[in-house]
Amino acid sequence: VPLSRTVRCTCISISNQPVNPRSLEKLEIIPASQFCPRVEIIATMKKKGEKRCLNPESKAIKNLLKAVSKERSKRSP
């Protein structure tokens, strides 16, 4: 399980691998703060609501973010 409430940062382990944008329920980008010194990306999957922590430094994840924002901009009027 990548999530924990016992540490300042939410993510314990992070993945460099992208997920299918169509499988995403929600994608949260949590900026670095006084509580956690790094940006965290938390993907909530449609299937079972499983949460995954993604590495914001990974090129594959950056490509995923681009794809998601492109999809969103298509949907917005």
Epitope: N16, Q17, K59
Partner: antibody, heavy 119, light 107 residues
Framework: QIQLVQSGPELKKPGETVKISCKAS????????MHWVKQAPGKGLKWMGW????????TYADDFKGRFAFSLETSASTAYLQINNLKNEDTATYFC????????????WGAGTTVTVSS | DIQMTQSPSSLSASLGGKVTITCKAS??????IAWYQHKPGKGPRLLIH???TLQPGIPSRFSGSGSGRDYSFSISNLEPEDIATYYC?????????FGSGTKLEIK
């Protein structure tokens, strides 16, 4: 050393199913996504999609939705490509390729599996 | 999808000579281009990534350059083992696309 070893050539009839394998060694299988690439005879390389090796979730390029299925046997560090209801136009060499996701490109390739579809 | 237009489709050059292959993307790919050498019966071999970064073990006879939409790949001091087909790949996108390939022959 890091390598991807693919299964041998296949000769199939139209309508049949083929399942080809790609066995990884020399690295942690679940650390990198696995992609599949098609090369039809006399043609160039065409990306088919990928499978997330941590979750087993496949993603298919638009031209490969429907009859194509990516799967894993994580305990054996093996990825599979299955093609159902084979057509003549599926005759090709299929490559598996590891993606170095952190930087985004394919850094290790299998030698390819030739699938021939002929009645 | 991003299209990659690769040229020429084939070329012939002399041993010791130099060849250049170009790839033009249909939009800015931010230098995220890789170059591969492909020989029959083998998997493609990564030569260069991020436009100009040589993979470990690849001789400095191979080089790449470019930015925006326009990229080039060169081989100098051609050797017999360079006979192969070369492909560019853009990876600035979740949907990967290859160039159509350039078949290199030695005169």
């Amino acid at each position: 050393q890091i390598q991807l070893v693919q299964s041998g050539p296949e000769l199939k009839k139209p309508g049949e199913t083929v399942k080809i394998s790609c066995k990884a060694s020399g690295y942690t299988f679940t650390d990198y996504s696995m992609h599949w690439v098609k090369q039809a005879p006399g043609k160039g390389l065409k990306w088919m999609g990928w499978i997330n090796t941590e979750t087993g979730e496949p993603t298919y390029a638009d031209d490969f939705k429907g009859r194509f299925a990516f799967s894993l046997e994580t305990s054996a560090s093996t990825a599979y490509l299955q093609i159902n209801n084979l057509k003549n136009e599926d005759t090709a060499t299929y490559f598996c390729a590891r993606n170095y996701d952190y930087d985004g490109y394919f850094d290790v390739w299998g030698a390819g599996t030739t699938v021939t579809v002929s009645s | 999808d991003i299209q990659m237009t690769q040229s020429p489709s084939s070329l012939s050059a002399s041993l010791g000579g130099k060849v250049t292959i170009t790839c033009k993307a249909s939009q800015d790919i931010n230098k995220y281009i890789a170059w591969y050498q492909h020989k029959p019966g083998k998997g493609p071999r990564l030569l260069i990534h991020y436009t100009s970064t040589l993979q470990p073990g690849i001789p400095s006879r191979f080089s790449g350059s470019g930015s925006g939409r326009d990229y080039s790949f060169s081989i100098s001091n051609l050797e017999p083992e360079d006979i192969a087909t070369y492909y560019c790949l853009q990876y600035d996108n979740l949907l990967f696309t290859f160039g159509s390939g350039t078949k290199l022959e030695i005169k």
